[in-house]
């Protein structure tokens, strides 16, 4: 037995026939000694005298809230519930299986942006006698602390014959950094209490991997002359994470009838405009996904065919680009060949993903697993690759981006990726560690020489131990590749010469 | 399934037109683009335009802009390229294909060899 | 328009090996980009589309990777009938285009 809060507590339950249950013993919160009687609920009957009162608890009907008191007067409340557990697992009646993105997936969260605010949402059948209560942290080890809203009734649906009621949440983490590559992964964890049944689920989650932005903005068309073609030009979201230079999205453009068995026209941009061919009664959508990270696209945002909205041009290209200097990032500190990182780094994420697209979709977090990716190098809140710390001086973000390439082209060089199951040299590991170690390269030139991070002694003996390992690098590295995309990215727009 | 079958060799004399066709079975016509790509022999590939059945829209590559013309006849499911002022560098093959994206091509016709020769 | 430069224009592979397949664009083209087979005598086979999206009932062992301007065609173990040549074609802009072709032969 455990106190939820104040007067409640949750009795755990192995739930079998002829269980013998748990013995609860509660005590009456009174200075008062004597003359003190128990009941349960709305009901008359005394179960027992005294300041304490054992009972033992089976099943629902032993469950509820015990009250005592004394000549008449309530001395004080305990509310029972009950926390089932049927062949070793939690009951999880309460909360609908979503089966989205796998099976056993109870609560969904998405965030529109990286400023540390993200929604989750749950569906239940039941309309009455329902509360929930989340809390949330970062990690869970030495938590960091998330504020989370009251959950609320956000939507009902008819699906069949049942009524479904989502809920929601917002959470906020108290000190955000956008920027960052997150090394800690958010703790939801969500209590719901049905009549007297108690239930908790939980997720775990990094922000990066619940992204899903708003559709684009304000969708232009400006019909081509003696074409066919349509230029059309949109906006990043307003809720979208800024400076656009940093916080880059690739685009997908689509022409489409109303029916998705309908043809339809078809191009991807990291731009803000593109030219597609328009034809009647067919629509015009965008929808936008993060540039450097495979996280969800957002939903389809459309506009018409027919009527080609304004003719304004709009061809702004969401911020990328920019000329680059030839020079490299020495020690001394000059600028690195920004335009070329930009484009070595882009073909990082882009590698790191083909690596091993299964592995976006894997749930790797196990027991353990938070210490086994504390040994790889993370770029934290404190190294300057956010936009302002790159304004201020690049070389600090460079040197632990450096340190990073290094760290992993070893990783990807050592057993773990050389020894069994092999891989060859020209897959796409053996490609993203030719460009790893190209881009670390770039940024220093021999000769000259940064601090590099120890690679730590993981030699896993068994070859699907190394395969969850590959598994577990790739992913961190697809993190780590993003943020140095977004830098350099960054660095081409505003910091070249 | 869906097939493109397209009509046989020609011979031709430079100055002249070639009317090619390819008729498409296995799917509702209108329902996806026709393209017209040719292979010149030894050569690689080269896109020549794309037709869309249902309005009779068009967009030819510029470098066949005003020599090229493609139409379809929703009556018989079939498509035709007719290519005007041959000039001997117009020998190849000419594929016609079919998909309901507008930038690939995904069902192929067999090829039909066009030679320009005097 | 924009130019398609696929390289080597030969490649010698003895079956059962890997073989990678280079495809660059003048300009940035994102992810749109297509892989296609064409043996002697036959039209073209579509294998790859949007840089790494398969179709289905082409063989696992040919997966596309790449953006921007770089573009990867890898076959994991080649098989006799891989032997053939094979093109990459944009579409991120009209006129579409292709490129040269590699050409890929028993080593």
């Known amino acids: 037995i455990w106190e939820l809060k104040k007067d409640v507590y949750v009795v755990e339950l192995d739930w079998y026939p002829d269980a013998p249950g748990e013995m609860v013993v509660l005590t009456c919160d009174t200075p008062e000694e004597d003359g003190i009687t128990w009941t349960l609920d709305q009901s008359s009957e005394v179960l027992g005298s005294g300041k304490t009162l054992t009972i033992q608890v089976k099943e629902f009907g032993d469950a509820g809230q015990y009250t005592c008191h004394k000549g008449g007067e309530v001395l004080s409340h305990s509310l029972l519930l009950l926390h089932k557990k049927e062949d070793g697992i939690w009951s999880t009646d309460i909360l609908k299986d979503q089966k989205e993105p796998k099976n056993k997936t109870f609560l969904r969260c998405e965030a529109k942006n990286y400023s540390g605010r993200f929604t989750c949402w749950w569906l239940t059948t039941i309309s009455t006698d329902l509360t929930f209560s989340v809390k949330s942290s970062r990690g869970s080890s030495d938590p960091q602390g998330v504020t989370c809203g009251a959950a609320t009734l956000s939507a009902e649906r008819v699906r069949g014959d049942n009524k479904e009621y989502e809920y929601s949440v917002e959470c906020q983490e108290d000190s955000a950094c956008p920027a960052a590559e997150e090394s800690l992964p958010i703790e939801v964890m969500v209590d719901a209490v049905h009549k007297l049944k108690y239930e908790n689920y939980t997720s775990s989650f990094f922000i990066r991997d619940i992204i899903k932005p708003d559709p684009p903005k304000n969708l232009q068309l400006k019909p081509l002359k003696n074409s066919r073609q349509v230029e059309v030009s949109w906006e990043y979201p307003d809720t979208w994470s800024t400076p656009h230079s940093y916080f880059s999205l690739t685009f997908c453009v689509q022409v489409q009838g109303k029916s998705a068995r309908e043809k339809k026209d078809r191009v991807f941009t990291d731009k803000t405009s593109a030219t597609v061919i328009c034809r009647k009664n067919a629509s015009i959508s965008v929808r936008a996904q993060d540039r450097y990270y495979s996280s969800s696209w957002s939903e389809w945002a459309s506009v018409p065919c027919s009527g080609s909205g304004s003719s304004r041009g709009g061809s702004g290209s969401g911020g990328s680009g920019g000329g680059g200097s030839k020079l490299r990032a020495v020690p001394g500190g000059s600028s690195p060949a920004w335009t070329q990182c930009q484009q070595l780094s882009q073909k990082l994420c882009t590698l790191a993903w083909s690596a091993h697209p299964l592995v976006g979709h894997m749930d790797l977090r196990e027991e353990g697993d938070e210490e086994t990716t504390n040994d790889v190098p993370h770029i934290q809140c404190g190294d300057g690759c956010d936009p302002q710390g790159l304004r201020d001086n690049s070389q600090f973000c460079l040197q632990r981006i450096h340190q990073g390439l290094i760290f992993y082209e070893k990783l990807l060089g050592s057993d773990i990726f050389t020894g069994e199951p092999s891989l060859l040299p020209d897959s796409p590991v053996g490609q993203l560690h030719a460009s790893l170690l190209g881009l670390s390269q770039l940024l220093q030139p021999e000769g000259h020489h940064w601090e590099t991070q120890q690679i730590p002694s993981l030699s896993p003996s068994q070859p699907w131990q190394r395969l969850l390992l590959r598994f577990k690098i790739l992913r961190s590295l697809q993190a780590f590749v993003a943020v140095a995309a977004r830098v350099f990215a960054h660095g081409a727009a505003t910091l070249s010469p | 399934q869906v097939q493109l079958v397209q009509s046989g060799a020609e011979v031709k004399k430079p100055g002249a037109s070639v009317k090619v066709s390819c008729k498409a079975s296995?799917?509702?016509?209108?329902?996806?683009?026709l393209h017209w790509v040719r292979q010149a022999p030894g050569q690689g590939l080269e896109w020549m335009g794309w037709?869309?059945?249902?309005?009779?829209?068009?967009e030819y590559a510029p470098k066949f802009q005003g020599r090229v013309t493609m139409t379809t006849d929703t009556s018989t499911s079939t498509a035709y390229m007719e290519l005007r002022s041959l000039r001997s560098d117009d020998t190849a093959v000419y594929y016609c294909?079919?998909?309901?994206?507008?930038?690939?091509?995904?069902?192929w016709g067999q090829g039909t060899m066009v030679t320009v020769s005097s | 328009e924009i130019v398609m430069t696929q390289s080597p224009a030969t490649l010698s592979v003895s079956p059962g090996e890997r073989a990678t397949l280079s495809c660059r664009a003048s300009?940035?083209?994102?992810?749109?980009l297509h892989w296609y087979q064409q043996k002697p005598g036959q039209a073209p086979r579509l294998l790859i589309y949007?840089?790494?999206q398969s179709i289905s009932g082409i063989p696992a062992r040919f997966s596309g990777s790449g953006s921007g301007t770089e573009f990867t065609l890898t076959i994991s173990s080649l098989q006799s009938e891989d032997f053939a040549v094979y093109y990459c074609?944009?579409?991120?802009?009209?006129?579409?285009?292709f490129g040269g072709g590699t050409k890929v032969e028993i080593k």
């Open positions: 949007f840089a790494s």
């Open positions: 296995g799917y509702t016509f209108t329902d996806y683009y």
């Open positions: 074609q944009q579409s991120n802009s009209f006129p579409l285009t």
């Open positions: 300009q940035s083209i994102s992810i749109n």
């Open positions: 037709i869309d059945p249902e309005n009779g829209d068009t």
């Open positions: 294909n079919a998909n309901k994206e507008l930038r690939y091509f995904d069902v």
